[in-house]
Interface confidence: medium
């Protein structure tokens, strides 16, 4: 056959769908690879062809669109399963072609089983809610296009295995689940089950997402440097190891980049001709506030190093702060026989 622009296997679009539920999968060509949409392609005389490779097989085969009740069908640039079966798992290819043009892309489709509590190997999207921040909502995801607006589905929400019917601060509002005030106890997996009729049959769509309650922007503060501070003096003798921790607390801020760095005499440690290492550790609170610690280490400090200025810097979307460490050369303890004797006038 003639040459075809092959975009390969698009593993970025690892599509997972539940067994025995409808699934509508758009050909990724128009979404991510080509600069025109399906309508333009269709009106230009291009044809969209679907085929697949079963799991653990190498053989490409056409998709059977003549199954009972049109279980698999194609509509424009969408491949429909009504519903899916476990053995639909495989790599699917959509190819756009005419006599002079050809472009194709493959993508993996995994049909996943779930248990009665909605547990499954499905990768779950995470929705972050601010703690104690007034009314916030999550919306049942990826249900657009499954039924026309004239159809009124029934939506049931679950937290874990339990139907949400005992409203503490969580209220089902159709496709939305409203959190009047979000608390740590609202962390968990939330599932919406959308039930709708189609051609005398009843279909269910199950969508699960993870809710993570995070620090509220109204409580957010600029970075706080806990160490170094004014109460600790780093007194060392030449030849000893110098260890200075820079410990910074960052309030959770959505999409904020938290940064911690040291300067030595106003320069980055890499720009100073001394043997310095910096080790970083990060910990998070239950509401995703972050504590970063960067330990500056000089194995064998010199008297020159003990005269330098060591400053810890921190930056977030809330602001930038800096704190200098107090570093001193340890004054050797006086030796009684010589120094003190001299002091008393001995010869």
């Amino acid at each position: 056959s003639e040459r075809c622009d092959d975009w390969g296997l698009d593993t970025m679009r690892q599509i997972q769908v539940f067994e025995d539920e409808p699934a509508r999968i758009k050909c990724p060509l128009f979404e991510h690879f080509l600069k025109f949409n399906y309508s333009t392609a269709h009106s230009a005389g291009l044809t969209l062809i679907w085929y697949w490779t079963r799991q653990d097989r190498d053989l490409e085969e056409p998709i059977n669109f003549r199954l009972p009740e049109n279980r698999i069908s194609k509509e424009k640039d969408v491949l429909w399963f009504r519903p899916t079966l476990l053995n639909d798992t495989g790599n699917y290819t959509c190819m756009l072609r005419n006599t002079t043009y050809c472009s194709k892309v493959a993508f993996p489709l995994e049909v996943v089983q779930k248990d009665s509590c909605f547990n499954s190997p499905m990768k779950l999207p995470v929705h972050k809610l601010y703690i104690e921040y007034g009314i916030q909502r999550i919306t049942c995801p990826n249900v657009d296009g499954y039924f026309p607006s004239s159809v009124k589905p029934t939506i049931t929400w679950y937290m874990g295995c339990y139907k949400i019917q005992n409203f503490n601060n969580v209220i089902p509002e159709g496709m939305n689940l409203s959190f009047l005030i979000a608390f740590i106890s609202n962390n968990g997996n939330y599932t919406c089950v959308v039930t709708y009729p189609e051609n005398g049959r009843t279909f269910h769509l199950t969508r699960t997402l993870t809710v993570k309650v995070v620090g509220s922007p109204k409580n957010a503060v600029p970075p706080v440097i806990h160490s170094p501070n004014d109460h600790v003096v780093y007194e060392k003798e030449p030849g000893e190891e110098l260890l200075i921790p820079c410990t910074v607390y960052f309030s959770f801020l959505m999409d904020s980049r938290n940064e911690v760095w040291w300067t030595i005499d106003g320069k980055k440690p890499d720009d100073i001709p001394i043997d310095v290492t910096i080790n970083e550790s990060i910990s998070h609170s239950r509401t995703e506030d972050e504590t970063r610690t960067q330990i500056l280490s000089i194995k064998k400090v010199t008297s020159e190093d003990l005269k330098r200025s060591y400053v810890c810097h921190a930056r977030s979307a809330k602001g930038e702060v800096a704190k200098a460490a107090t570093v001193k050369q340890k004054v050797p303890a006086p030796r009684y026989t010589v120094e003190l004797a001299c002091g008393f006038g001995a010869t």
Partner: antibody
């Protein structure tokens, strides 16, 4: 099926004490916020107070007329909510309802009648 | 005197549409969701409408709620004799740090 059943109502003298219990079933009681609402004879509904789940701090809020005299507590191991009423006044005479939720009261018990009279 | 204000009574004939109002302020209805309860004679109250216009399962769609600013209303269309009951609105109140109820509206089906 969600059920809440109040018990412990009765006749008590002014200044006396009484403890109401509310047995809950059919939902995860430990995760639920619970409230008490009362209704004086021939009058409207009046919120008494609520208790949050332990995971949300287990804290309580009370209506001004009962603050300092009434205490709401819970025993998650027994799926039971309590209302301890001290220094009772004649105006506390009412049917006391136990309800699920802290904002939206979706399930109600049948109520326990408390009569404060000398 | 209740924090939320409701008319003490309302009436209508079978099949009619009746509306019950509930008036509050910025610290309750203006800021929080409104709930409506129905109390049939001699029974415990029952949740009818919550959060603007959501109905628990089993509540007919003849009942609907709406909210505008610091006021809310409950509408009952296609009035039936079994709708004869007391209706209460409720909302959380920030300034009082508690739930406040309306005084209740007695609905009579003529």
């Amino acid at each position: 099926e969600v059920q809440v059943v109040e018990s412990g109502g009765g006749l008590v003298k002014p200044g006396g004490s009484l403890r109401l219990s509310c047995a809950a079933s059919g939902f995860i009681f430990s995760k639920a916020w619970m409230s008490w609402v009362r209704q004086a004879p021939g009058k409207g509904l009046e919120w008494v107070g609520r208790i949050k789940s332990k995971t949300d701090g287990g804290t309580t809020d009370y209506a001004a007329p009962v603050k300092g005299r009434f205490t709401i507590s819970r025993d998650d191991s027994k799926n039971t909510l309590y209302l301890q009423m001290n220094s009772l006044k004649t105006e506390d005479t009412a049917v006391y309802y136990c309800t699920t939720g802290g904002y939206v009261f979706d399930y109600w018990g049948q109520g326990a009648l408390v009569t404060v009279s000398s | 005197q209740s924090v939320l204000t409701q008319p003490p009574s309302a009436s209508g004939t079978p099949g009619q549409r009746v509306t019950i109002s509930c008036s509050g302020n910025n610290s309750n209805i203006g800021s929080y969701i409104v709930n409506w309860f129905q109390q049939l004679p001699g029974t415990a109250p029952k949740l009818l409408i919550y959060s603007k216009n959501q109905r628990p399962s089993g509540v007919p769609d003849r009942f609907s709620g709406s909210k505008s600013g610091t006021s809310a209303s409950l509408a009952i269309s296609g009035l039936q004799s079994e709708d004869e009951a007391d209706y209460y609105c409720a909302a959380w109140d920030d300034s009082l740090n508690g739930v406040v109820f309306g005084g209740g509206t007695k609905l009579t089906v003529l």
